[in-house]
């Protein structure tokens, strides 16, 4: 039997054992989070699958993910949302210690999809494990990109109080308007609910004592936020290692000095 022709994309294919991974993550999440125990993981997988299976992987819309978003509805308490840009690992290390703060990946839908890749093929029920569209080289409306855009928008829309964002001070653009934070989340914070955005700029070098809150891209962020009438604050985190240590042990004498 001749193998059926398959579209060749520039990006890596669907993560191996994708359905099993999503289902297992869902079960684990609902066991650990009592408020989500009512969630039926099989329905979640069916909704996830329904968003991209049999669809042309360059023509996925936010609408495709709405059934999944509905099933994964979750609220974060006011003042407890942590956004991040280009510094995922530290943000996740932080929320693992500061358990009452939440990144998108601490929520069910973000947890399910974190670090995974997936796509299907038009008119077949198969998952494409060989290749998936690359955002730059192929198309932006691919299953993975649209998923993160959809859930990031929703995460930002539901945030309230003081919202925090962790930014990577080692990058040339500390605030990048083309990042998910810069292109989606910033614009979907609701001024009626969000009083302020507080940026934590994480320094890379041990000897870096510059005030990165004065960086031009941070001022650009403030400019965007100010038009939406949301207050903006910024803090330098000069020593991320010490920062995490002090979150774990706030009573430590060294934590009374600056971080």
């Amino acid at each position: 039997v001749l193998p059926r022709w398959r579209q060749q994309w520039s990006g890596s294919g669907t993560t191996s054992r994708f359905p099993e991974t999503v289902l297992a993550r869902c079960v684990k999440y609902t066991e650990v989070h009592p408020e989500m125990r009512h969630v039926d993981c099989q329905s979640v997988w069916d909704a996830f699958k329904g968003a991209f299976i049999s669809k042309y992987p360059c023509n996925i819309t936010e609408e495709d993910y709405q059934p999944l978003v509905k099933l994964g509805t979750q609220t974060v308490p006011c003042n407890k949302t942590l956004l991040w840009s280009r510094i995922k690992d530290l943000a996740h290390q932080f929320t693992q210690v500061q358990r009452d703060m939440f990144t998108l990946e601490d929520m069910l839908l973000g947890y399910l999809a974190d670090d995974l890749t997936w796509c299907g093929e038009f008119n077949t029920f198969e998952i494409n494990y060989q290749s998936c569209p690359d955002w730059r080289k192929d198309c932006s409306n691919n299953p993975v990109s649209v998923f993160w855009k959809t859930v990031s928008r929703r995460f930002a829309e539901t945030a309230c109080g003081v919202v925090h964002v962790m930014l990577n001070g080692s990058r040339s653009k500390i605030f990048d308007k083309n990042s998910t934070f810069g292109s989606v989340e910033v614009h979907n914070l609701q001024p009626e609910k969000v009083q302020a955005l507080e940026a934590w700029v994480i320094h890379g070098g041990r000897e870096d004592s510059r005030d990165l809150c004065q960086d031009p891209t941070i001022k650009e962020l403030e400019s965007i936020i100010s038009k939406r009438n949301i207050r903006f604050f910024c803090k330098n985190i000069y020593r991320p290692d010490k920062f995490l240590q002090c979150v774990k042990n706030p009573e430590d004498s060294s934590c009374l000095s600056g971080i």
Partner: antibody
Framework: EVQLLESGGGLVQPGGSLRLSCAAS????????MNWVRQAPGKGLEWVSS????????YYADSVKGRFTISRDNSKNTLYLQMNNLRAEDTAVYYC???????????WGHGTTVTVSS | QSVLTQPPSASGTPGQRVTISCSGS????????VNWYQQLPGTAPKLLIY??QRPSGVPDRFSGSKSGTSASLAISGLQSEDEADYYC???????????FGGGTKLTVL
């Protein structure tokens, strides 16, 4: 004294080009988003274009998109507006104005007049 | 046709209180900063109100308010030097643009 001073206006034929400049003084130009706003004779204010602090992104009114280009040189404290393929309806006084976070356009120049006519 | 809607004219006698309205939508006035500008005859516009507050140097006779998708400018104790054009403006999230009202010509009778 905080000041914005526009120059480069004049009479130009339809289809022609002009480059407006706006020299800033008395404030840290590189800390502000900048704008061009115009006012046709006897009409109201119309926003034309904005440029971010670093110049890395720009916005345009639909009426000028593809014809006008906003730029800035932070080392020279100067804002520019390159206007190509000018039309009669572009005839206006062109003002440059800064955007101060949480305030709005708080410093305006006196304006430079652009007349597009054959 | 302006995105923000203002009455074309308003008038009052000296000492009176006058209000100018500005109507928009959720993507501009509804969620964003609202400004009011005063333009005296033959001069450049001047920032009068930002987010219902006055910049320094603007008399407290001028005040701004906002409710839902509408904003208004109130001038109490009207004076002859208040005769000018008044414009509301806001950033519009949908258009990625500053939008202005058509302007209101205030006449002091």
């Amino acid at each position: 004294e905080v000041q914005l001073l526009e120059s480069g206006g004049g009479l130009v034929q339809p289809g022609g080009s002009l480059r407006l400049s706006c020299a800033a003084s008395g404030f840290t130009f590189s800390d502000y988003e900048m704008n061009w706003v115009r006012q046709a004779p006897g009409k109201g204010l119309e926003w034309v274009s904005s440029i971010s602090i670093t110049g890395s992104w720009t916005y345009y009114a639909d009426s000028v998109k593809g014809r006008f280009t906003i730029s800035r040189d932070n080392s020279k404290n100067t804002l520019y507006l390159q206007m190509n393929n000018l039309r009669a309806e572009d005839t206006a006084v062109y003002y440059c104005a800064n955007y101060k976070s949480y305030y709005g356009m708080d410093v305006w120049g006196h304006g430079t007049t652009v007349t597009v006519s054959s | 046709q302006s995105v923000l809607t203002q009455p074309p004219s308003a008038s009052g006698t000296p000492g009176q209180r006058v209000t100018i309205s500005c109507s928009g939508s959720r993507s501009n006035i509804g969620t964003n900063l609202v400004n009011w500008y005063q333009q005296l005859p033959g001069t450049a516009p001047k920032l009068l109100i930002y987010n219902v507050q006055r910049p320094s140097g603007v008399p407290d006779r001028f005040s701004g308010s906002k409710s839902g998708t509408s904003a208004s400018l109130a001038i109490s104790g009207l004076q002859s030097e208040d005769e000018a054009d008044y414009y509301c403006a806001a950033w519009d999230d949908s258009l990625n643009a500053w939008v202005f009202g058509g302007g209101t010509k205030l006449t002091v009778l």
